[in-house]
């Protein structure tokens, strides 16, 4: 029997019946065996076919076989109900070999010309399968010349059989207190030849509960327990399963915080698998009872390990653990079923005893000594000599624990001394002056420190004076002996004050005229205001209307009198303001240098002389009565004048205070 070409020779060619295209002889038998390379098949088709027709092709025939399988037995010229002629059909080998057998019997009724066929090797597309047949590959099939290969979707790995995709389903660890896990692809069929391991690992103290949900379908066997595919559940205490079949397993209360779930599948079957919903429980903690005036959040039916609650107090109540305040409180349930900290109290906010108000007092409005939330107190200043600055003195104990004014201020009100009060009625006639009576000049300050000078009290801790009077002590403020509240210069009965700092106007030049002859002394303590010690007011913007030419001002001091000695008793003099041009002119003639009188000065005195301030009065205040407020204010500071006090045609020269209000305010606010 002739053999066809064998691989690796080119596999293609022609076959024909003996004698073709002539008629074939009787009693012929020919066999051709064609072999293609692995992964290839043989294709065969006929270009001519003319054989004797017989029932079931018993007489003459061409038989095509591939391995043990007969592909076709052919005869005749055209197919009938029981016989087949190739016509235009193409035949394919099942593997890489094809056997062709031609046979003719002992006779032919008429001449038949036989057949001619052509064959060739072609690649098998292993990826194409007939309907109903198992696919070549589990997931993806890739054909190539002479063969094919399989690959898998993400999350799978090719089994060593090179066709099955096993799920990569191990190593998943679930750490949440509840969750779901299922067989791969659920609810679609689970993969073959897979071994899945899932771990649930919760904190110690939790117990895992497993519920099988929806559906359960794992390949089973009627007699043997789960021989093919199975699900097992393992804890540190016991093993549950194996499970298979179609019945949902019962709830499993593992009493363990760690669970391992194993799912193993074989190479066959088509089942949807399983789904587990897991929860956890733990020993519950005692139900938290909110303290009075507080509430628990969140509210739960029960609280187990890791659950927590917070306490929130009503407005006006605060969290306290004993005496210690807390801004927030959260307790956490522990594995032994106890809370990690005890319940605090919600105590009513207590603002505590209010601070004492210097030069004032406090009154409990709500009730004696009541200092809790919403309690009201009233601050007031000592009448006559002090007045409350800014607020009305009413304070409420607010939820934040601070006494708070109606304007929202948490700081104490300020009792500011009332300024410009005097016992004196205007009228009456230092040089050429009169003795002051108690309370006439309560702002008068005696400054001793090398020389005798004066000043005027501002507020309760500042003294306004002349720069030239304290220039020598500017770097040694503590050397100044400051006395107030007395009329007699040498009296042992006075209020002593000491200087903390001396501020001399930066525009003042010592021994070069008296421009900017103004200074402030800061006292190291506040003085107590009374009828004999009261500050002078600073001039209002409108004050100039009370300081026009010929308006009367009052100067006071212990300076030289007509007798040429320092006064023992405080003296004062009422003197009119002098026209500025007139005063300037009076000091233009020698021995005074030109420009001695500046716009920062004002002059006062009589043209005829006799009434003046003198040496020892320096730094004292020239005061005026503001008839609108009925308070005295400082218009001038005793600065300089003629060598002979009270000289006719010469005037006392005073620092014009209204020009220095910004300077004074800046120093006082900064220091």
């Amino acid at each position: 029997t002739p053999l066809g070409p064998k691989w690796p020779e080119p596999v293609f060619g022609r076959l024909a019946s003996p004698g073709f295209p002539g008629e074939y002889a009787n009693d012929q038998e020919r066999r051709w065996t064609l072999t293609a390379p692995p992964g290839y098949r043989l294709r065969l088709y006929f270009t001519h076919f003319d054989l004797e027709l017989s029932h079931l092709c018993e007489y003459d025939f061409v038989k095509l076989s591939s391995g043990a399988k007969v592909l076709a037995t052919l005869c005749g010229q055209e197919s009938t109900d029981t016989e087949r002629a190739p016509g235009k059909d193409t035949f394919y080998s099942l593997g890489s070999s094809l056997d062709i057998t031609f046979r003719s019997d002992y006779s032919n009724e008429k001449p038949f010309t036989g057949f001619e066929a052509f064959y060739a090797a072609e690649d098998i597309d292993e990826c194409q399968v007939a309907p109903g047949e198992a696919p070549t590959c589990d997931h993806h099939c890739h054909n190539h010349l002479g063969g094919f290969y399989c690959s898998c979707r993400a999350g799978y790995v090719l089994h060593r059989n090179k066709r099955t995709c096993s799920a990569l389903c191990s190593g998943q660890v679930f750490t949440q207190r509840s969750g779901e896990l299922s067989s791969p692809e659920y609810p679609r069929p689970y993969p073959k030849l897979s071994s899945c391991t899932y771990s649930i690992s919760l904190e110690e103290g939790f117990s895992v509960i497993l519920d099988f949900v929806e559906s359960f379908d794992v390949e089973t066997h009627p007699e043997t327990l789960c021989p093919y595919d199975f699900l097992k559940i393992q804890t540190d205490r016991e093993e549950h399963g194996p499970f298979c079949g179609k019945t949902l397993p019962h709830r499993i209360e593992t009493k363990s915080n760690t669970v391992t779930i194993t799912f193993v599948t074989d190479e066959s079957g088509d089942h949807t698998g399983w789904k587990i919903h897991y929860t956890s429980t733990a020993q519950p903690c005692p139900y938290p009872m909110a303290p009075p005036n507080g509430h628990v959040s969140p509210v739960q039916a029960k609280y187990i390990l890791k659950d927590s609650f917070s306490i929130f107090c009503e407005t006006g109540y605060e969290l306290l653990q004993g005496h210690l305040p807390l801004k927030s409180f959260t307790a956490v349930c522990q594995k032994d079923g106890s809370w990690d900290r005890p319940m605090p109290a919600c105590s009513i906010v207590d603002c505590g005893p209010p601070d004492d108000l210097p030069s004032g007092r406090v009154e409990y409005i709500t009730g004696p000594g009541v200092t809790t939330y919403k309690a009201v107190i009233q601050y007031s200043c000592e009448e006559t000599f002090y007045t409350m600055k800014v607020n009305d003195g009413k304070y409420v104990c607010e939820a934040d624990g601070f006494w708070t004014s109606s304007k929202g201020e948490k700081s104490l009100p300020v009792c500011e001394p009332v300024c410009g009060l005097s016992a004196r009625t205007t009228g009456g006639r230092i040089y050429g002056g009169q003795k002051a009576k108690p309370g006439d000049f309560p702002w008068q300050v005696l400054i001793l420190g090398g020389t005798t000078a004066a000043g005027a009290l501002l507020y309760d801790n500042w003294v306004l004076t002349a720069a030239h009077a304290v220039y020598e002590q500017k770097h040694d403020a503590s050397a100044l002996d400051i006395r107030m509240g007395t009329l007699k210069r040498l009296s042992p009965h006075y209020t002593q004050a000491w200087s903390e700092a001396v501020f001399i106007h930066e525009g003042y030049t010592h021994d070069a005229g008296f421009d900017n002859d103004i200074a402030l002394i800061k006292l190291n303590n506040k003085v107590v205001i009374n009828s004999n010690i009261t500050p002078i007011c600073l001039p209002r913007k409108e004050a100039e209307s009370f300081m026009r030419t010929d308006d009367i001002g009052t100067a006071s001091g212990w300076g030289l009198t007509q007798r040429g000695f320092l006064a023992r008793n405080l003296m004062y003099v009422d003197i009119p303001i002098v026209d500025h041009q007139k005063c300037t002119a009076a000091y233009e003639k020698p021995p005074y240098p030109r420009g001695s009188v500046t716009a920062n000065m004002l002059c006062a005195g009589l043209e005829s002389g006799g009434k003046d301030s003198c040496r020892g009065d320096s730094g004292g205040a020239l005061v005026f009565l503001d008839s609108e407020t009925e308070r005295w204010f400082v218009g001038g500071i005793v600065s300089w004048g003629s060598m002979n006090c009270g000289e006719a045609g010469q005037y006392g020269v005073y620092t014009k205070v209204i020009n220095y209000i910004p300077w004074i305010e800046n120093i006082i606010s900064d220091f």
Partner: antibody, heavy 115, light 107 residues
Amino acid sequence: DVQLQESGPGLVKPSQSLSLTCTVTGYSITSDYAWNWIRQFPGNKLEWMGYISYSGRTSYNPSLKSRISITRDTSKNQFFLQLNSVTTEDTATYYCAILYAMDYWGQGTSVTVSS
Amino acid sequence: DIVMTQSQKFMSTSVGDRVSVTCKASQNVDTNVAWYQQKPGQSPKALIYSASYRYSGVPDRFTGSGSGTDFTLTISNVQSEDLAEYFCQQYNSNPLTFGSGTKLEIK
């Protein structure tokens, strides 16, 4: 990690004021809790002096109330102790601390009152 | 002021033993009591708060108990590093007050 650190002069003259600073790192003094000053005398006796709370409210030991002031600077996360008119009896190691809910103490600073 | 009395100034024990340090309040302080351990040259370190709650990181051989006026710190299985002075403290009311201390000596 929460840390408290005391600082201030180690020697103070009688009748003067003692001023100490506690610098807190790792936690804001306005977030929660009471921020305390505690002192330990020679012989180890401990005395609570007072606190300033997260809200700025103060509570003082009544035995010191006329002399003590506790303040804070929230921008620097510091709180301060001022004790006026000190005597030799105020010689001690001074600690700043959070008590109760969290427990953190400074390492302490030794203050001697002596002329 | 509430006085916290630690009647035993010194206590002697051996490694592995169990020892109880007591503290008595002069009036009811509920459970608002803390226990402190102070080793020489160190700041006090809190062990227990609210009478029986252990601070995190404190070994479980330290146990606190009591309420009202009588309080106990128990150290089971005493270790050599437990050599220290132990103070109780009440924070129930102003002023907060400390006990005078109990020194634990290891035999």
